[in-house]
Interface confidence: medium
């Protein structure tokens, strides 16, 4: 009986040892697997942390962009309001300009938008001519032309083009007895306008100034005492209609 029990215990012991060995093996495997899983988990945690960090960066960027968008929208609104205000101002100014142009029209004669002369002046090509009704000496005539923003005429636009005398005949009154007008032409060969220095010197030294003289339909350039009282012709370049 004792022997039987002893044998049974030994057999049970062997079974337990085999089971224990198997369990220990399984435990080692599980520990290894658990270690692997812990490592994987660690890796996942790191990845998660990186993802969270990236997300935060993206969120910050998004917030910044959103801030910029809001600033742009505010700017757009401000610009829109400014534009509307300026558009209103422009319309008001255009209206004012239109009114002003209508008020100015009687003071100008225009062949085109580019060639305008003050009212009462005669337009020819790109020049405006004013024939005085009063007589003055040469210096006073020049000063008077200057107060009218012009100079004594040199007929620069018409001379030396052909048939310019036809223009002069239409520009100035007819008269068989002869008409003389002070001019800015000088006595040199090319009939250029004398400069101020030369003019003053000529005036002081010779006291002779130049006039255009008309007899019949002929024009001649002649000298006359600068102190003589004659009508005069002023000339200015035609201008654009004020816009």
């Amino acid at each position: 009986r004792y022997l039987q029990v002893s044998q049974q215990l030994q057999q049970t012991n062997r079974v337990l040892e085999v089971t224990n060995s198997s369990l220990r093996q399984q435990l080692r495997l599980k520990i290894t697997q658990l270690g692997q899983s812990a490592e994987d988990l660690q890796g996942s945690r790191r990845e998660l942390a990186q993802s969270q960090e990236a997300l935060q960066v993206e969120q910050r960027a998004h917030q910044a962009a959103e801030g910029q968008l809001q600033a742009c929208q505010a700017d757009r609104q401000k610009t829109k309001e400014t534009l509307q205000s300026e558009e209103q101002q422009r319309r008001a100014l255009e209206q004012k300009l239109s009114n002003m142009e209508n008020r100015l029209k009687p003071f100008f004669t225009c062949g085109s938008a580019d060639t305008c002369c003050p009212s009462g002046w005669i337009m020819h090509q790109k020049s405006c001519f004013y024939i005085s009704l009063t007589s003055k000496n040469w210096q006073e005539s020049q000063k008077q032309c200057e107060t009218l923003s012009s100079k004594l005429a040199t007929f620069s636009e018409i001379y030396p083009q052909s048939h310019s005398y036809y223009f002069l005949n239409s520009l100035l009154p007819n008269g068989g007895s002869g008409n003389s007008y002070w001019t800015g032409l000088s006595s040199n060969k090319d009939w250029k306008l004398t400069d101020d220095t030369q003019r003053t010197r000529t005036y002081a030294q010779s006291s002779k100034c130049n006039k255009v003289h008309k007899t019949w339909s002929w024009w001649t350039l002649e000298s006359e005492s600068c102190r003589s009282s004659l009508p005069y012709i002023c000339e200015m370049t035609a201008f654009r209609f004020p816009d």
């Epitope: 001379y159 030396p160 083009q161 052909s162 048939h163 310019s164 005398y165 002069l168 032409l185 009939w191 255009v212 339909s217 002929w218 024009w219 001649t220 350039l221």
Partner: nanobody, 118 residues
Amino acid sequence: QVQLQESGGGLVQAGGSLRLSCAASGTIFDWYSMGWYRQAPGKERELVAGIDTGANTYYADSVKGRFTISRDNAKNTVYLQMNSLKPEDTAVYYCAAHDDGDPWHVYWGQGTQVTVSS
């Protein structure tokens, strides 16, 4: 360049006649208006008579009915027939050529003396 040569001047009794001639060279004569001017001592030069390219004529009031201007384009010459001369017609008579396309440019002859004695 236009050259003008006057001839026909001289001394004449009051009531007499003279014919001045002016020959032009160096130009196309037909293109020029021609005139006779005169200048008496101490006086300004004045236009006595003129004839344009269309043969229209002009006379100073003081010579109307007494002087006649004419031109002969074939001979490049302009004439001034002066009748019923008076002492106040005494002057140097100048021939002038006006270029219609160049109003300030006047070509002058040397002048010929006309003296009318009373």
